[in-house]
Interface confidence: low
């Protein structure tokens, strides 16, 4: 394992405290506790973190002191299980405390909630935030870590430290600026959007490890790192994949101190060996640790080596294909994936994995046949339709996006997905379809060579959100099937779903379409969400409604909101005009 082979330490907690330093140690313990006990008040978590930190210091002073030899899971689990209100607040999660390690930690992991019942974070006035920041900077930043971690229980902990550093920098700069709001608000918006994206990307990594196993994650990592570092040797990529898998397994498993420590070691190794990895790492490697790790994770693909030979020679034409495959199946398939991915930065990772799976299936079948070479000779021909399917889909959807713009493109997807899986809750359909719709502005601006990796890998992240939210309360067999059968075929599985003909339309409820004057004070985004929620409900009432019918109703709805928001007596307008709108909509849709 190279980087991660460490000497045995008498005290694991002392070792991590010394490696990470007090500030990072405290921040990571706070993140870990907030991700496990998502409902606990901030003050309770701070108290627990301080107790753990004091204990860690005693172990640094004397590694042989009492309890210093205990594992981190034992120490942290014991501390979490001292929370007095565990049973009342968390119900059956309290049963975890009756278990021994490692089962207790596994039990806590099982109870992480992707959609916790927490109030939406409301941003206070800028002056209020700046005062709080100046009054107690440490508490202010801890609160940020706590609020993000409890809402995103799989957030990549070392990356959250990087976000907190940027959060601090934004307040340090902007609270002294002449126009505090103009300086601060765009920075906070950017951090919020980037944070949501980072959380969703990490959630997919954890789902990949937890649901499909280490082999699936390693395959993903081989493909992605081979695209990013096409000049690196296969052995180098394999080593990075092994180390990266360890880092993410630790973070997804709640071992945040080990994860952060190992991520720092991996960044150090990459920078010490950049000559044999990539020519694009120079700037990243000059940055401080948190920025360096983030930069490496986001670094652009290196240029492909010139004159790479044809893949067919080693993987189709060679007489030794079956011999090489039989000797070490996963290594041979890994080499295939590496060679294919380094030649194709223009493909999505999931497409590369589909190609590798097709290649594997063909070899399994053909290496047992009478004439293996004859059998697998045309294997690359089987790749053509697999490549064309996402290319065509992206082309069509980018054309639609360019024609409609983001909001209406989202609406088209809302209708499409509600018809496919109408049993899914309306908030989930709105959230997921809005995010699916963002693929347009995110990826369609790119040239052809960058569109597919941008679009399809982003869609994998968004569809994973649907999968984890649906798993909490499963309502649709079709969603379960697409989410669980194959990680790399999730998007094609959802794309292939037609209208659910078995769905019994929802009863019409006028209350769902009753609006009030408060809609006028909402931001544009919030108003869009209200309208999109109504659109999903319409489709659930009338799944066979045509595009034209739905468009007419939505246009009427937009006009109604605009009219009443301009009226002197807004509430009366919403009440009277709303009744007319509901009646007209029912007539238009034949409800």
């Amino acid at each position: 394992r190279g980087v991660f082979r460490r000497d045995a330490h008498k005290s694991e907690v002392a070792h991590r405290f010394k490696d990470l330093g007090e500030e990072n140690f405290k921040a990571l313990v706070l993140i870990a506790f907030a991700q496990y006990l998502q409902q606990c008040p901030f003050e309770d978590h701070v108290k627990l973190v301080n107790e753990v930190t004091e204990f860690a210091k005693t172990c640094v002073a004397d590694e042989s002191a009492e309890n210093c030899d205990k594992s981190l899971h034992t120490l942290f689990g014991d501390k979490l299980c001292t929370v007095a209100t565990l049973r009342e607040t968390y119900g059956e999660m309290a049963d975890c405390c009756a278990k021994q390690e490692p089962e207790r930690n596994e039990c806590f992991l099982q109870h992480k909630d992707d959609n916790p019942n927490l109030p939406r974070l409301v941003r206070p006035e800028v002056d209020v935030m700046c005062t709080a920041f100046h009054d107690n900077e440490e508490t202010f930043l801890k609160k940020y870590l706590y609020e993000i971690a409890r809402r995103h229980p799989y957030f990549y902990a070392p990356e959250l430290l990087f976000f907190a550093k940027r959060y601090k920098a934004a307040f340090t700069e902007c609270c002294q600026a002449a126009d505090k709001a103009a300086c601060l608000l765009p920075k906070l918006d950017e951090l919020r959007d980037e944070g949501k994206a980072s959380s969703a990307k990490q959630r997919l990594k954890c789902a990949s490890l937890q649901k499909f196993g280490e082999r699936a994650f390693k395959a993903w990592a081989v493909a992605r790192l081979s695209q990013r570092f096409p000049k690196a040797e296969f052995a180098e990529v394999s080593k990075l994949v092994t180390d990266l898998t360890k880092v993410h397994t630790e973070c997804c498993h709640g071992d945040l101190l080990e994860c952060a420590d190992d991520r720092a070691d991996l960044a150090k190794y990459i920078c010490e060996n950049q000559d044999s990895i990539s020519s694009k790492l120079k700037e990243c490697c000059e940055k401080p640790l948190l920025e360096k790790s983030h930069c490496i994770a986001e670094v652009e693909n290196d240029e492909m080596p010139a004159d790479l030979p044809s893949l067919a020679a080693d993987f189709v034409e060679s007489k030794d294909v079956c011999k090489n495959y039989a000797e070490a199946k996963d290594v041979f398939l890994g080499m295939f994936l590496y060679e294919y991915a380094r030649r194709h930065p223009d493909y999505s990772v999931v497409l590369l994995l589909r190609l590798a799976k097709t290649y594997e299936t063909t070899l399994e079948k053909c290496c047992a046949a009478a004439d293996p070479h004859e059998c697998y000779a045309k294997v690359f021909d089987e790749f053509k339709p697999l490549v064309e399917e996402p290319q065509n889909l992206i082309k069509q959807n980018c054309e639609l996006f360019e024609q409609l713009g983001e909001y209406k493109f989202q609406n088209a997807l809302l209708v499409r997905y509600t018809k496919k899986v109408p049993q899914v809750s309306t908030p989930t359909l709105v959230e997921v379809s809005r995010n699916l719709g963002k693929v347009g502005s995110k990826c369609c601006k790119h040239p052809e060579a960058k569109r597919m990796p941008c679009a399809e890998d982003y869609l994998s992240v968004v569809l994973n959100q649907l999968c984890v939210l649906h798993e909490k309360t499963p309502v649709s067999d079709r969603v379960t099937k697409c989410c669980t059968e194959s990680l790399v075929n999730r998007r094609p599985c959802f794309s292939a779903l037609e209208v659910d003909e078995t769905y019994v339309p929802k009863e019409f409820n006028a209350e769902t379409f009753t609006f009030h004057a408060d809609i006028c004070t909402l931001s544009e985004k919030e108003r869009q969400i209200k309208k999109q929620t109504a659109l999903v409900e319409l489709v659930k009432h009338k799944p066979k409604a045509t595009k034209e019918q739905l468009k007419a109703v939505m246009d009427d709805f937009a006009a109604f909101v605009e009219k009443c928001c301009k009226a002197d007596d807004k509430e009366t307008c919403f009440a009277e005009e709303g009744k007319k709108l509901v009646a007209a909509s029912q007539a238009a849709l034949g409800l």
């Epitope: 089962e103 196993g213 280490e214």
Partner: nanobody, 126 residues
Framework: EVQLLESGGGLVQPGGSLRLSCAAS????????VAWFRQAPGKEREFVAG????????YYADSVKGRFTISRDNSKNTLYLQMNSLRPEDTAVYYC???????????????????WGQGTLVTVSS
């Protein structure tokens, strides 16, 4: 390729106990997610209990929680199902199933398990 062989089924009175075993060969059992399913006459195959690959994270169907315990002995490459407080409705053929790739989480969907044993019959009757 994983081969699975169940044993330990039989006739038992209501309230009694049985311990099923599933011996695996061809792959280390701790590298696969393994589960017990059961199928009663005329009914669909249903998930009973499961354990993740690489870590001992366990899952149970609501109908058996508190009565059944799944475990594995890596040194013997064997999966177990300890069944206590048995009821007549537990009567079924019990199957052991494996899903390689070290998934940490067990799936409850039978179709996702490529490897199956031949089953062992458990009859609960007075």
């Amino acid at each position: 390729e994983v081969q699975l062989l169940e044993s330990g089924g039989g006739l038992v009175q209501p309230g009694g106990s049985l311990r099923l075993s599933c011996a695996a060969s061809g792959r280390y059992i701790d590298e696969t997610a393994v589960a017990w399913f059961r199928q009663a006459p005329g009914k669909e195959r249903e998930f009973v209990a499961g354990i993740g690959g690489g870590v001992d994270i366990t899952y149970y169907a609501d109908s058996v929680k508190g009565r059944f315990t799944i475990s594995r002995d890596n040194s013997k490459n064997t999966l177990y199902l300890q069944m206590n407080s048995l009821r007549p409705e537990d009567t079924a053929v019990y199957y052991c199933a494996a899903r390689p790739g070290r998934p940490l989480i067990t799936e409850k969907v039978a179709d996702l398990y490529p490897y199956w044993g031949q089953g062992t019959l458990v009859t609960v009757s007075s």
